[in-house]
């Protein structure tokens, strides 16, 4: 297994609809054809998997149907979108990239993107 550099933004603010997007870029040392991308969340001394997708270079990322993640790939960049976020989901979201095929296997882990989620205030009742 070999190490690989992964870059991602330090901070992202989720939209009022609970959607956050960020780019995960990896420095591929070779011509990988099969790539696995995993989003992890670190909070309260625990790391949990948020979502994961394996894709063939040049093809779309496919997350599971019930996944809160969607994404597109372009070269060595993956554009990730996480939806359905609430204030309690604020945390450090880490991009993990694995070059699965062909060998050798490469693993890269980003420094994490701190995603801040603010629940929208309910609209006040209108007098009209």
């Amino acid at each position: 297994c070999k190490a690989m550099h992964v870059a991602q933004p330090a901070v992202v603010l989720a939209s009022s609809r609970g959607i956050a997007s960020f780019v995960c870029e990896y420095a591929s040392p070779g011509k990988a054809t099969e790539v696995r991308v995993t989003v992890l969340r670190q909070a309260d001394s625990q790391v949990t998997e948020v979502c994961a997708a394996t894709y063939m270079m040049g093809n779309e990322l496919t997350f599971l149907d019930d996944s809160i993640c969607t994404g597109t790939s372009s070269g060595n960049q993956v554009n990730l979108t996480i939806q359905g976020l609430r204030a309690m989901d604020t945390g450090l979201y880490i991009c993990k990239v694995e070059l699965m095929y062909p060998p050798p296997y490469y693993l890269g882990i980003g420094n994490g993107t701190q995603i801040y989620v603010i629940d929208p205030e309910p609209c006040p009742d209108s007098d009209f």
Epitope: Q42, Q46, I109, N111
Partner: nanobody, 126 residues
Framework: EVQLVESGGGLVQPGGSLRLSCAAS????????IGWFRQAPGKEREEVSC????????NYADSVKGRFTISRDNSKNTVYLQMNSLRAEDTGVYYC???????????????????WGQGTQVTVSS
Amino acid sequence: EVQLVESGGGLVQPGGSLRLSCAASGGTLDYWSIGWFRQAPGKEREEVSCISGTGLRTNYADSVKGRFTISRDNSKNTVYLQMNSLRAEDTGVYYCTGKLLHPSLWSACANEYDLWGQGTQVTVSS
């Protein structure tokens, strides 16, 4: 809250083997840096081995190199210390320790640890 529990200690003859286990309760050890320390009677606690959060890096004290092997099985939420060719000087209480580092350090061992287990006694004697 995560707690670490060691097991696998016991009495073994010189040249024998033991496998210590460090299991987590109340959470997972995924991406945690895990270390094994030992304390012999009347001596200071010393670090024996550690494994990085990714499992890609392992370190060993000179006194156990080539005899001890640290490994992790995330599916079992457990870290192991395989101890071969045991010597009398390996006798002591062995402690499992852990720390979840920032992701930028997941490929490294921790310099200090937040969490300690209760320890398991290893005695090497004929």
